[in-house]
Interface confidence: low
């Protein structure tokens, strides 16, 4: 047969929860403190929650059935009778004595035909204000008619025929009524939800709804025209010609920003915005949702994305709606004919409006941005340069911040790019320039995403004309070839000396993609005598042991996700693993990540490593003299001049790279 | 070196005009934000008005509104503020200001002043 | 308009001394969604024009000695000068920037004995 409307869905669930119960019983949820009812589907079942509000279960004849005395559960079916005792039946008891007042009415209800009523259930008569209700029975009862006939639809319509964004024709000046059936089984009528449903009578069919309603005269424009409330977004609005929508056909959620949401943002930000056509549409767009989205379809957290492209997360806190956890809802379902509106008193700017300065400020980055600010950077950063920013995380500062120097100045230069960047574009090996003149490497792997030594922490924030993109790392250009670091480091002249002795000086020189993991001085000391003598005892096998150290791609840290078997120059493969934020290649820890080279990146060992082929055996090949010679050299250099940066903070190590 | 020179300052009569001019030197004018704030012969600073990098927007207190126009050219680095209908409350020491960056609000480089006197 | 009030409106102390003077606003210059304060402090010595100390109520502008701090958030700020050197003396505005007319403070005058 034809799929099951949503509505049939959820009552078919709350069915499956009540037959323990006998036959035709359906579980409904209960606020608590409340007479609101919900027959129940599973996520509800399961959180007994409705609006962050505790519920309790009641077990309940379904639709069309009552209890027999007796006998387990509700097994007759209500007797069909007219639509004015249907209306008692259902429980609408007021309904029927307005009807009975109007004369005209109840003869109707009681004769042929075949009618729909959206019964107001008597709470939903008794919360009308009272000068509603006395004008409703004045005037010889035409308005109270009138009233009751938009109720009403002349034919029969059962909640399978109630299609989302659909209108009927009521029989009050054929007005219409706006129907929406959410895909969580909640249907309203003009934003009233729908209590009791599909309730047969021998003339129709009557649903319980928890509002009187009333006819819809205004579209979502002439509302924002009328009221006083929206002076500035009636200005923002005409500015943007985004008018010509809202008076059109359609339905949408309008989020109406008051004067007083607009008066709470700072004036340069708002100045900025209204003076900017792009960045005015996309925040009026973002305020403004695709369909109609009545208050009572909500009853927990739900994704919906905007005109704009933002994704809000829509909920309810009890009787509060909320926009991102927040109750600032301050009037809500106010109806229009091609949609409805919720006043909210806080603008919801998205990111495709701001800054960079902005987009970081409400990102965990503003030690970089301070930085920023202080290099003299700032007007890259608010202006209307099409830049993506790489902003390394608040944790990265932890031990510090570094002295505003040239180095330093020179070093954010290269944090940001010289185009406006999308993360999902970027594509392994592509180069970016940056303002400080650098060419900076991408890299892709299975789980992140790196920029040289950096790696992206965080979904991008698209700004008005820059992209934030969050960093876990200070970025470190690199400053020559892997044979450039190693000699500008005193830590490796042995290391140098032994690539030298084994032929390798041009491999590490020339372009290509190399991963190093560079053995200290104090590595090759630590090595015993013998395999020290074993590894310079000729130029091949010395060759061998480092291209192992040698990498055929370029593997930084923040690419490791939890082990990479990378494949070495000599043929074996390392194993790369990351645990708890350290880096260890065949099991042994990375004193020092991510230096980065143009042709590689270079890590720092404390160990000599050693190929799997050699591990197990014995050697006893002699020194070769010039090599031995070579190293003893590079080892009385290296005494001689000692560095400290190891004990220096990270930035410190960056800035003295930089000055070689 | 950040510089701001005042001039146009002056004695005036009530009623009566002054064109206020700031020589900008040693930043990228058509870069930053810029400002004119008086101090009052009470001390008090008072904010007269903004105009933005491109001098497309101009903002001011409602004291001088209609009164003073704040103008930009930055072909030749200066900031102007003409000032028509002068009262004696606006009698005070005239500085030209620069802001921090393009959007930012706060007054980062302040002249030296230019004086104003209104007095019949 | 949002009025700001600064206390006291004069302190005299002596050098080496912790002084602290505070800044009130009418309304709140937190803005939320970047939580940051809209608020500056200026100094100006006896015949010069005012120079800016600190930003954002906290972030002191570069060559401001650290003994000059700034703290608060909402509507109540402080300007603490750790230890009083004799070229302080000055008087010092708190100005907000949360919103058009930009307000100063009537200032406090500082005084060394």
């Known amino acids: 047969g034809p799929a099951k409307s949503p509505y049939q869905l959820v009552l078919q669930h709350s069915r499956l929860r009540g037959r323990q119960h006998g036959p035709n019983v359906c579980a409904v949820q209960k606020v608590i403190g409340t007479n609101r009812k919900y027959f129940t589907n599973c996520k509800q079942w399961y959180q007994r929650k409705i609006c962050g509000k505790s519920t309790v279960i009641s077990y309940e004849c379904c639709p069309g059935y009552e209890k027999v005395p007796g006998e387990k559960g509700c097994p007759a079916a209500l007797p069909l009778s007219n639509l004015y005792e249907t209306l008692g039946v259902v429980g609408s008891t007021t309904t029927q004595l307005y009807t009975d007042r109007t004369e005209k009415l109840r003869p109707e209800m009681e004769g042929p035909g075949s009618f729909t009523i959206f019964a107001p259930s008597n709470e939903a008569w008794a919360s009308l204000p009272a000068e509603v209700l006395d004008s409703l029975v004045s005037n010889v009862n035409i308005e109270l008619l009138n009233a009751l006939r938009y109720h009403m639809v002349g034919r029969r319509v059962l909640t399978d025929e109630l299609k989302h964004g659909m209108t009927l024709t009521s029989m009050y000046q054929n007005s219409n009524i706006q129907i929406h059936h959410y895909p969580n089984g909640i249907v309203t009528v003009n934003c009233a939800r729908l209590l009791k449903a599909d309730h047969h009578a021998t003339n129709g069919v009557v649903h319980l709804i928890d509002k009187v309603i009333s006819t819809i005269t205004n579209n979502i424009q002439q509302i924002i025209e009328i009221e006083d409330t929206f002076e500035t977004l009636r200005a923002a609005v005409a500015a943007s010609g985004l008018n010509t929508m809202l008076e059109g056909n359609g339905q949408y959620t309008l989020l109406a920003p008051t004067n007083e949401a607009f008066e709470k943002i700072p004036s340069e930000t708002l100045n900025r915005i209204l003076g900017d056509p792009e960045a005015l549409r996309d925040l009026l767009n973002n305020h403004i949702l695709k369909s109609a989205m009545c208050a009572e379809a909500i009853v927990a957290g739900l994704s919906v994305e905007t005109l704009e492209g933002t994704t809000l997360e829509v909920g309810c806190s009890g009787d509060m709606l909320t926009i991102n956890g927040k109750a600032i809802i301050s009037n809500k379902d106010i109806l229009a004919t091609n949609g409805v509106i919720h006043y909210i008193d806080e603008l919801l700017i998205p990111d495709s409006a701001k800054t960079l300065f902005e987009l970081a400020a409400e990102s965990d980055v503003s030690t970089a941005i301070d930085l920023f600010r202080q290099a003299g950077l700032g007007n890259h950063l608010s202006g209307s340069e099409r830049l993506t920013l790489l902003a390394p995380l608040n944790s990265v500062f932890k031990d510090g911040t570094p002295p505003i120097d040239a180095h330093t100045r020179n070093l954010l230069r290269n944090h940001i790019i010289k185009d406006q960047l999308a993360s999902k574009y970027l594509y392994h090996g592509q180069t970016l320039e940056t303002l400080g003149g650098k060419k900076l490497r991408v890299f892709v792997y299975r789980n992140s995403l790196c920029i040289e030594n950096s790696c992206i922490a965080a979904h991008d924030k698209r700004g008005r004309y820059g992209t934030l993109f969050t960093m876990d790392r200070v970025l470190t250009p690199p400053m020559g070839t892997v044979m450039d670091v190693l000699k500008g480091d005193n830590r490796f002249s042995m290391l140098v000396a032994a690539i030298q002795s084994a032929g390798l000086t041009e491999t590490l020189n020339r372009e290509g993609v190399y991963t190093v993991f560079a053995p200290t001085n104090e590595a090759f000391r630590a090595l015993p005598p013998r395999e020290r003598s074993r590894l310079l005892g000729d130029a091949k096998e010395l060759a061998n042991i480092l291209k192992y150290h040698i990498g055929d791609e370029i593997l930084v840290s923040g690419g490791i996700g939890a082990l990479v078997r990378l494949k070495s120059l000599q043929g074996d493969k390392l194993e790369v693993s990351l645990k708890n934020n350290v880096v260890s290649v065949n099991k042994e820890p990375v004193a020092e990540p991510d230096i980065m080279a143009t042709n590689g990146v270079v890590h720092v060992i404390t160990n000599v490593l050693q190929p799997p082929a050699n591990r197990p055996q014995e050697r006893g090949d002699e020194l070769a003299d010039s090599a031995l010679e070579i190293f003893k050299q590079a080892s009385a250099f290296s005494r001689a001049s000692q560095r400290s940066v190891r004990l220096a903070p990270v930035y410190q190590k960056l800035l003295e790279r930089m000055k070689h | 070196e950040v510089q701001l020179v005042e001039s146009g300052g002056g004695l005036v009569k009530p009623g009566g005009s002054l064109k206020l001019s700031c020589a900008a030197s040693?930043?990228?004018?058509?870069?930053?934000?810029m400002y004119w704030v008086r101090q009052t012969p009470e001390k008090r600073l008072e904010w007269v008005a903004t105009?933005?990098?491109?001098?497309?927007?101009?903002y001011y207190p409602d004291s001088v509104k209609g009164r003073f126009t704040i103008s930009r050219d930055s072909a030749k680095n200066n900031l102007y503020l003409q000032m028509t209908s002068l009262k004696s409350d606006d009698t005070a020491m005239y500085y030209c200001?620069?802001?921090?960056?393009?959007?930012?609000?706060?007054?980062?480089?302040w002249g030296q002043g230019t004086l104003v006197t209104v007095s019949a | 308009d949002i009025v700001m009030s600064q206390s006291p409106s004069s302190l005299v102390v002596s050098a080496g001394e912790k002084v602290t003077m505070t800044c009130k606003s009418s309304?709140?210059?937190?803005?939320?969604?970047?939580?940051?304060?809209?608020l500056a402090w200026y100094r100006q010595k006896p015949g010069q024009s005012p120079k800016l100390l600190i930003y954002?109520?906290?972030t002191r502008e570069s060559g401001v000695p650290d003994r000059f701090t700034g703290s608060g958030s909402g509507t109540d700020f402080t300007l603490t000068i750790s230890s009083v050197k004799a070229e302080d003396l000055a008087v010092y505005y708190c100005?907000?920037?949360?919103?058009?007319?930009?307000?100063f403070g009537g200032g406090t005058k500082l005084e060394i004995k």
């Open positions: 200001v620069r802001g921090w960056d393009r959007y930012d609000s706060w007054f980062a480089c």
């Open positions: 040693g930043f990228t004018f058509s870069d930053y934000y």
């Open positions: 105009i933005s990098d491109g001098g497309i927007y101009t």
């Open positions: 309304q709140s210059l937190l803005y939320s969604s970047n939580q940051k304060n809209y």
């Open positions: 954002w109520a906290s």
């Open positions: 100005q907000q920037y949360y919103r058009y007319p930009y307000t």
